[in-house]
């Protein structure tokens, strides 16, 4: 090995990665909110919809104070990976009725992927354990009907909205601990 030499700084550090993750999450939350509103306008929901394959909400307002960095990032990444797969599935399985929202769903998927990359980079830089990404709990088959895919879209966007909402709060809280 040669004599000690300094390395130039790379483009970001863990704290900058966390800032970036917060910005991406906020932006994704706004997109999801807007898309969910479009869905409600075009296809009014009759009550709440759910999908067994979606992850259960990880955090409540009451548990925010006890959050630990590894747990939050691991859970967030696993949950977002699940939503990413569900959006992918929705785009493939959607009937003609949902095709009008294809550009928005495509953009949502791309932004989700970007956030997942940023979270993974952050976990790598912090050397936090990276769990094996979960497959959806229930295999995603084609929706039973056009109405089935609309109900699925309501459930996916609603769940993603709630997940991103706690994610923003959780990540902002974690910023103070890094």
């Amino acid at each position: 090995p040669g004599p000690p030499a300094g390395s130039p700084r790379v483009s970001s550090d863990p704290r900058a990665d966390l800032d970036s993750a917060v910005l991406l999450t906020r932006s994704l939350l706004a997109d999801t909110r807007q898309l969910a509103a479009q869905m409600r306008d075009k296809f009014p929901a009759d009550g709440d919809h759910n999908l067994d394959s979606l992850p259960t909400l990880a955090m409540s307002a009451g548990t925010l104070g006890s959050l630990q960095l590894p747990g939050v990032l691991t859970r967030l990444r696993v949950d977002l990976m699940s939503y990413f797969r569900h959006v992918q599935w929705l785009r493939r399985a959607a009937g003609p009725s949902l095709k009008t929202l294809e550009p928005e769903l495509g953009a949502l998927q791309a932004r989700l992927e970007r956030l997942l990359r940023r979270l993974q980079l952050l976990m790598s830089r912090l050397a936090l354990p990276q769990a094996a990404p979960d497959q959806p709990a229930v295999p995603l088959g084609p929706p039973a009907s056009a109405w089935g895919s609309i109900r699925a879209a309501h459930a996916i966007l609603g769940g993603l909205h709630l997940t991103l909402d706690w994610a923003v709060r959780g990540l902002l809280l974690l910023k103070t601990r890094l």
Epitope: G6, S7, R9, V10, D13, P14, R15, P70, M81, L116, R117, Q120, L121, S124, R125, L126, A127, L128, P129, Q130, A131, A132, P133, L178
Partner: antibody, heavy 114, light 111 residues
Framework: EVQLLESGGGLVQPGGSLRLSCAAS????????MHWVRQAPGKGLEWVAV????????YYADSVKGRFTISRDNSKNTLYLQMNSLRAEDTAVYYC???????WGQGTLVTVSS | QSVLTQPPSASGTPGQRVTISCSGS?????????VHWYQQLPGTAPKLLIY???ERPSGVPDRFSGSKSGTSASLAISGLRSEDEADYYC???????????FGGGTKLTVL
């Protein structure tokens, strides 16, 4: 400018012990996970151990598990590798690395030979 | 034997485009873990060249690019120069080993 400076390498007999240190500067050491990666003469890179930014998680390659211990002192910006029960196959340049790893030190040579 | 598989050698003439492959499995690259690439010039420490599959650290020329698909990744070097002669390593997290894994390295020769 980021600096990672390894020390503590040298010649040691099989079964012996050695403690490597890595002094970090030029970045927020306490915000980075840290690795030890080694390279045997003329061979490729082999990951040895990693410790999380706060020291709460430590993982080791199977080849060193139970013999090597990684630790860090964030107040001193220093990473350590305690190597016990050394074998001839542990002979390598040992690099300290930060993050992905994003940054690497220049390495310190450990030779295990009788 | 390395967990990630790379060709031991590659070569090209100045100005040419060269690609180096890196093949993994379902416990690393195939599990959607990011791939990073390192350049090791003779007698020096490795240097981060590409991170998160296709992102370049500041100071790395845009002649270097990365991509990933399924359980494989590749590094492309366009406009090959003599100073690119080095060993190139890919790396990714492996959840079964709970740590990063490296490829065996590819020695690039500029003819």
């Amino acid at each position: 400018e980021v600096q990672l400076l390894e020390s503590g390498g040298g010649l040691v007999q099989p079964g012996g012990s050695l403690r490597l240190s890595c002094a970090a500067s030029g970045f927020t050491f306490s915000s980075y996970g840290m690795h030890w990666v080694r390279q045997a003469p003329g061979k490729g890179l082999e990951w040895v151990a990693v410790i999380s930014y706060d020291g709460s998680y430590k993982y080791y390659a199977d080849s060193v598990k139970g013999r090597f211990t990684i630790s860090r002192d964030n107040s001193k910006n220093t990473l350590y590798l305690q190597m016990n029960s050394l074998r001839a196959e542990d002979t390598a340049v040992y690099y300290c690395a930060a993050g992905v790893p994003d940054y690497w030190g220049q390495g310190t040579l450990v030779t295990v030979s009788s | 034997q390395s967990v990630l598989t790379q060709p031991p050698s590659a070569s090209g003439t100045p100005g040419q485009r060269v690609t180096i492959s890196c093949s993994g499995s379902s416990s690393n690259i195939g599990s959607d873990y990011d791939v990073h690439w390192y350049q090791q010039l003779p007698g020096t420490a490795p240097k981060l060249l590409i991170y998160s599959n296709n992102e370049r650290p500041s100071g790395v020329p845009d002649r270097f690019s990365g991509s990933k698909s399924g359980t494989s990744a590749s590094l492309a070097i366009s406009g090959l120069r003599s100073e690119d002669e080095a060993d190139y390593y890919c790396a990714a997290w492996d959840f079964s080993l709970y740590g990063p894994v490296f490829g065996g390295g590819t020695k690039l020769t500029v003819l």
